[in-house]
Interface confidence: medium
């Protein structure tokens, strides 16, 4: 049977007729204990017969009275089956059993949908004795129902290890409906269909679901929960709720916010953080998203000379760390640098265009075919070189160090000489005579000094041996790391 | 976007000469080397030289030298080639292209060729 | 002069396939010296891979390189009909500038 407890819970009778230690008399229970545990042990005393009882698990007692009559089976007597009570109320049920007093060791227990209930729940247990049973009433109170304790209740008796369960009494809290799935908020492309998806729950169902766009509502009928709305496309941002209605109410739940994806916002506040003969390192603020993640970004490096062509130089990079270092760049040279970034939407404008040098470097590769002479007769070293390509001197040539080393038995001395820019030879005096003659040029800017060429060898004889064969850099190996000419 | 348009088809005569022009735009002219390769009928490349056009340095391939003289017009962003003394193993298609600067050296962009046909 | 030798100098090849193309060097190389071009029947050569392992602007993920010292390779996953064309490697490593002497694949 169904016994509703709309706004109220009140006190069931706990058994269909009046039996010794029922309610209906007027005796006062001999003991009431608190169910802490989840157990209570029975107190047992001379038997009577106890009322007759429904359904529930029976235990047939195997022990026999003198006349060897067989006791009547154990079971919990009939009780209200379900309450239904609105979130908040309180509420009081109740199982109840007789038991001979023969039986020791009986305890009672509290499950709910399959699980024990221990501590902090208010369970009583009251005991009323007679000459033959005892009765026992075992009440469970909640003071405030949530919809946590919707459920099934038990109660359990052990009695000489046999197991007494009592029916079911259910427990239906009744509420406004209570979102399990609210719309979440999105980003989506213009124009293009999306879902939204709300589930409510009672009881009481059903659960009705209306949609709300900008306070409005979307449809005129109602949807029975769970609902999904699918939006066919937007053009702006759009704020999205769902109603939830049942017998006790409304719920609303949160607005969402729908974004429209876009470009994203041009990067701000492009910097230079380094700057070489050959690279700029550039940080840069991202802008706005467009509500799409960044995917990367492109630094733009045009050559800020009034006579170029304005074309421009693209290196592309990951979003983060927002940070690049822009490479194989020409020494002293003047760059416009902008950075744009792109989503799945498209590319960002370009940031504003900032201004950066690079640095005068030192050059990049040696003088090339260095030939030395001996001019005996003058007592002199001719060094005869070609300067390196422009584009890898790396800054204003300033000039040449001219490195010669003089060796013979026992003696070895290193001097350097500089030559101006215009230069492509140079004479050096014997320093030394019947020793080897080693000479290596380096071309100098005011970023530095390059590095020096292959070293040429020339013997340089005693007074009187003539020998005027030039001596030339041999071919490079083919490990040098910049482009043999 | 970048591009090399070269001058049209010639044909020459043995002991002649053929010059090719090179028109670049779509960046610096004078930032980039200018190469010429050139390609025989159903043979591969063959690199003939380079030129830098901000300052005219060159460097020929030995095989090409005291034949060929590279030039530039930076006024006009144009290059040439210039090619003497030709011989029947001359017939090619030459090509101008791009020397990518970071002396790596690879060619980023190419002409649409010039067929140079010697014939008696 | 720093001779390329390919290999092979022509490969017949059912699209889906899988292609490698060799690249021999006379002399050791530097990775980042060594590149390959695409060129295509009466097209002009097209940069395909830089520095090795790069691939240039607008090429298909299914090509790629590899190498190192004398010896580099260029691939190219799963075949399609568009790819077929003479394939060239090139040193940038030293003067002459030289290139091998081209792989031709064809589509069956």
């Known amino acids: 049977a169904i016994t509703e407890a709309r706004e109220e819970a009140k006190p069931y009778p706990l058994f269909p007729g009046p039996f010794p230690g029922s309610l209906q008399t007027d005796h006062t229970p001999l003991l009431s204990l608190p169910h802490a545990s989840g157990y209570q042990p029975a107190l047992m005393f001379s038997p009577t017969q106890p009322g007759r009882p429904h359904t529930g698990n029976v235990a047939i007692p195997q022990v026999t009275s003198v006349e060897s009559k067989p006791l009547p089976p154990l079971a919990f007597k009939h009780t209200v089956g379900h309450i239904i009570l609105s979130e908040h109320k309180g509420v009081k049920f109740n199982c109840s059993i007789s038991v001979p007093n023969i039986y020791q060791d009986t305890t009672i227990s509290w499950w709910k949908d399959g699980k024990e209930l221990l501590g902090a729940h208010h369970a009583i247990t009251q005991f009323y004795p007679d000459d033959e049973v005892t009765a026992i009433i075992a009440s469970f109170s909640i003071t405030s129902v949530q919809r946590s304790d919707n459920g099934s209740y038990i109660c359990k008796m052990k009695i000489n290890n046999e197991e007494i369960v009592s029916d079911p009494i259910y427990i239906e809290v009744q509420g406004l409906p209570h979102f399990t799935k609210q719309p979440e908020s999105m980003n989506v492309t213009r124009n293009t269909a999306f879902n939204l998806t709300c589930q409510a729950v009672g009881p009481p169902e059903p659960v009705n679901i209306f949609w709300v766009q900008n306070s409005s509502r979307v449809n005129e009928q109602p949807e029975k929960s769970p609902s999904v709305l699918t939006v066919p496309g937007l053009t702006e941002m759009a704020v999205f709720s769902c109603e939830a209605h049942n017998d006790k109410g409304l719920t609303v739940s949160k607005g969402v916010q729908i974004n429209i994806k876009a470009i994203p916002s041009p990067p701000t506040e492009v910097s230079i953080r380094n700057s070489t003969a050959h690279s700029i390192l550039i940080s840069w603020v991202p802008g706005f998203d467009g509500y799409s993640p960044f995917r990367n970004c492109s630094i733009q490096v045009k050559e800020a000379d009034p006579l170029s062509n304005g074309s421009v130089m693209i290196f592309n990079t990951s979003a983060l760390p927002h940070l690049y270092q822009i490479k194989q760049l020409q020494a002293l040279a003047n760059y416009s640098i902008g950075v744009s970034c792109m989503n799945e939407i498209g590319w960002s404008a370009v940031s504003p265009w900032i201004l950066a040098s690079t640095t005068e470097g030192a050059p990049s590769v040696a003088p090339l075919n260095v030939t030395v002479f001996l001019n005996e007769s003058s007592d002199n070293v001719d060094i005869r070189w070609m300067k390196p390509p422009t584009k890898q001197q790396d800054g204003e040539l300033v000039g040449y160090r001219i490195s010669h080393v003089w060796q013979s038995a026992g003696i070895s001395k290193e001097l350097l000489e500089e030559v101006g820019q215009n230069g492509s030879r140079a004479r050096i005096s014997v320093q030394v005579h019947n020793a080897t003659c080693t000479v290596r040029i380096a071309a100098v800017t005011r970023g530095g000094v390059g590095p020096f060429s292959d070293p040429v060898k020339i013997f340089i004889p005693a007074h009187g041996w003539v020998d005027y064969a030039p001596s030339s850099t041999p071919a490079p190996g083919n490990a040098d790391p910049v482009l043999i000419i | 976007q970048v591009q090399l348009v070269q001058s049209g088809a010639e044909v020459k005569k043995p002991g002649a000469s053929v010059k090719v022009s090179c028109k670049a735009s779509?960046?610096?002219?004078?930032?980039?080397?200018i190469n010429w390769v050139r390609q025989a009928p159903g043979q591969g490349l063959e690199w003939m030289g380079w030129?830098?056009?901000?300052?005219?340095?060159?460097k020929y391939n030995e095989k090409f030298k005291g034949r060929v003289t590279m030039t530039t017009d930076t006024s006009t962003s144009t290059a040439y080639m210039e090619l003497r003394s030709l011989r029947s193993d001359d017939t090619a298609v030459y090509y101008c292209?791009?020397?990518?600067?970071?002396?790596?050296?690879?060619?980023?962009?190419w002409g649409q060729g010039t067929t140079v046909t010697v014939s008696s | 002069e720093i001779v390329l030798t390919q290999s092979p100098d022509f490969q017949s090849v059912t699209p889906k396939e899988k292609v490698t193309i060799t690249c021999s060097a006379s002399?050791?190389?530097?990775?980042?010296?060594f590149h390959w071009y695409q060129q295509k029947p009466d097209q002009s050569p097209k940069l395909l891979i830089k520095?090795?392992?790069n691939l240039a602007s607008g090429v298909p993920s299914r090509f790629s390189g590899s190498g190192s010292g004398t010896d580099y390779t260029l691939t190219i996953n799963s075949l399609e009909a568009e790819d077929a064309a003479t394939y060239y490697c090139?040193?940038?490593?030293?003067?002459?500038?030289?290139f091998g002497q081209g792989t031709k694949l064809e589509i069956k």
């Open positions: 292209t791009r020397g990518y600067y970071d002396n790596l050296y690879y060619f980023d962009y």
């Open positions: 779509g960046y610096t002219f004078t930032t980039y080397d």
């Open positions: 030129i830098y056009p901000r300052d005219g340095y060159t």
């Open positions: 002399s050791i190389i530097s990775s980042n010296y």
């Open positions: 520095r090795t392992s």
């Open positions: 090139q040193q940038g490593r030293s003067v002459p500038l030289t």
